[in-house]
C-alpha cells in the first residue's frame, strides 16, 4: 500500500511495538454535522420487525450509556398488523469501539475495547431445514 | 452519587480540564467472546429490506475499514419476492467512536471522533402526509 511519511511534528513515542499506548485527545470531534434526528428516530416503532431500546449503563466506559435494541417479536408484523411467524425478527448487530478506564477509576488512562451491540431489528426469511 | 476513589496507581496527568489528552492502550480487549459471526452474516440477503455492504477505508482512522450498509431498494420484498413500494427500506444508523490520527500521519497521536454509520436496513410503514 501507500507509505505515508511520518509527520515530523508528531509527539515522541519510545514504544513502537503493538500493543502500544498512544496519546488521545478526548475533545470529541462530531462528524455527524448535517444529521436529521427525525430521520431514524421512530423506525423502532414503524418497522415490520419493531424493537425496544434498553439502557446499558457502565460508568467505567465511554460512552457510559448505550441503548440496545431488543426485537419485540419472534415473527414480523404483517399488513394486517399481526405477528407473522413464517418470518423472523432478528437483531442487526455491530461491533463498536468503547473506552474502558484501566486501571479502574483512573481519570486519564484507558484501554480500547470492542463490544457487540444490537442496533435495531430486521425481518428475514427463515432458514428451513428439511428432514429427509 | 457514589464517589469512586481515584486509584493510587493511576498515571499522572497535569491537565484536569476537558478537553484533555490521555493515554490509551490500543491492545484491544474483545468482550464478544461467545458470539457466532455467521449468525447474522447473511441477514443482508435474507432481509425483506436487503442491503449491500460498501467498504469505507481511511488510513488516517482507526478502524481504517468500516463496512457501510446501503439499502438495495426503496421498497421492501414481499412474499412473492417482488419489491412492494407501499413499504420502505430504510437504513438503521449508529453513532460510533473512531480514532483519527492527529496531527495527520502520526502513529501515536489520535483524537476521538464520532461518526454515523449505516449498519443494516429495516422495513418500515411509510409516513403518509394527508393534504387538507
Amino acid at each position: 500500500g501507500i507509505t505515508i511519511p511520518r509527520n515530523p511534528g508528531c509527539p515522541n513515542s519510545e514504544d513502537k511495538n503493538f500493543p502500544r499506548t498512544v496519546m488521545v485527545n478526548l475533545n470529541i470531534h462530531n462528524r455527524n454535522t448535517n444529521t436529521n434526528p427525525k430521520r431514524s428516530s421512530d423506525y423502532y416503532n414503524r418497522s415490520t420487525s419493531p424493537w425496544n431500546l434498553h439502557r446499558n449503563e457502565d460508568p467505567e466506559r465511554y460512552p457510559s450509556v448505550i441503548w440496545e435494541a431488543k426485537c419485540r417479536h419472534l415473527g414480523c408484523i404483517n399488513a394486517d398488523g399481526n405477528v407473522d411467524y413464517h418470518m423472523n425478527s432478528v437483531p442487526i448487530q455491530q461491533e463498536i469501539l468503547v473506552l474502558r478506564r484501566e486501571p479502574p477509576h483512573c481519570p486519564n488512562s484507558f484501554r480500547l475495547e470492542k463490544i457487540l451491540v444490537s442496533v435495531g431489528c430486521t425481518c428475514v426469511t427463515p432458514i428451513v431445514h428439511h428432514v429427509a | 452519587g457514589i464517589t469512586i476513589p481515584r486509584n493510587p496507581g493511576c498515571p499522572n496527568s497535569e491537565d484536569k480540564n476537558f478537553p484533555r489528552t490521555v493515554m490509551v492502550n490500543l491492545n484491544i480487549h474483545n468482550r464478544n467472546t461467545n458470539t457466532n459471526p455467521k449468525r447474522s452474516s447473511d441477514y443482508y440477503n435474507r432481509s425483506t429490506s436487503p442491503w449491500n455492504l460498501h467498504r469505507n477505508e481511511d488510513p488516517e482512522r482507526y478502524p481504517s475499514v468500516i463496512w457501510e450498509a446501503k439499502c438495495r431498494h426503496l421498497g421492501c420484498i414481499n412474499a412473492d419476492g417482488n419489491v412492494d413500494y407501499h413499504m420502505n427500506s430504510v437504513p438503521i444508523q449508529q453513532e460510533i467512536l473512531v480514532l483519527r490520527r492527529e496531527p495527520p500521519h502520526c502513529p501515536n497521536s489520535f483524537r476521538l471522533e464520532k461518526i454515523l454509520v449505516s449498519v443494516g436496513c429495516t422495513c418500515v410503514t411509510p409516513i403518509v402526509h394527508h393534504v387538507a
Partner: antibody, heavy 123, light 107 residues
Framework: EVQLLESGGGLVQPGGSLRLSCAAS????????MMWVRQAPGKGLEWVSY????????TYADSVKGRFTISRDNSKNTLYLQMNSLRAEDTAMYYC????????????????WGQGTMVTVSS | EIVMTQSPSSLSASVGDTVTITCRAS??????LAWFQQKPGKAPKSLIY???NLQSGVPSKFSGSRSGTDFTLTISSLQPEDFATYYC?????????FGGGTKLEIK
Amino acid sequence: EVQLLESGGGLVQPGGSLRLSCAASGFTFSPYSMMWVRQAPGKGLEWVSYIYSSGGWTTYADSVKGRFTISRDNSKNTLYLQMNSLRAEDTAMYYCARDTSLWFGDNDAFDIWGQGTMVTVSS
Amino acid sequence: EIVMTQSPSSLSASVGDTVTITCRASHDINTYLAWFQQKPGKAPKSLIYAASNLQSGVPSKFSGSRSGTDFTLTISSLQPEDFATYYCLQYDTFPLTFGGGTKLEIK
C-alpha cells in the same frame, strides 16, 4: 452553579405552536442526553421526549408523536421542544432534565431539572 | 410499555415516623429506577438513582431498594420538610414511565 432554565411557555390557541427552550449552564452540555417531562395541573409527571447527546436520535411519547420535535444546539448549550398542533390536553408545566453524562457517568441519571415553563392551550 | 404501579397513592404519617413507598414494574427494568420528591409549585428533586444509590447532597434518611420488579423508597425519621409527593421513574426502556405518585401528608 449547574442549572437548567426553561423558557418559551405561554397561552396559545388550540392548533397553535410554541417553541420551548432549555438553557444549560455550569456544565459541558454536549455529553448529556436530555429529556422533556410535563405535568398537567393537579396531575402526575409524564415523560414527553428524549434526545441523545449528539442529537443523533430522538424518541417521543405516543401522546405527542408527530406533533412535537425535540432538538438541541450543543454550541448554544440549549435544548428545544417545538410543539405544533397543540391541544387542550397539552396544557401543563414543562420541565427539562439531564440524563447521565456519556462521559464515564460523571453524574447520576436525571439529577438536574429546570424550574419549568407553563404552557396553556385554550381558546 | 412498562407500567409503574406506585402505592399507596396517599399516606398520612407523623413527624419522626418511618414510611415506605413501593413501585412495581410490569416487566424487568434491571436497576434503572429513580425516585423524586416534589413540593407544590416546585420542580421534581432527584433522591435516588439506580434503585438504591443516593443522589449527591440527599440525606441518608432516604434509602431505596430492589427486589425483582418491586422497588421501595424508605424515609426514616420524618421531618416537616419531607411531606411532599414522591414519584418513581423507570428509565430502562422507552417510553420512560413514571409511577402515579404518592402524596405524603402530616397526620
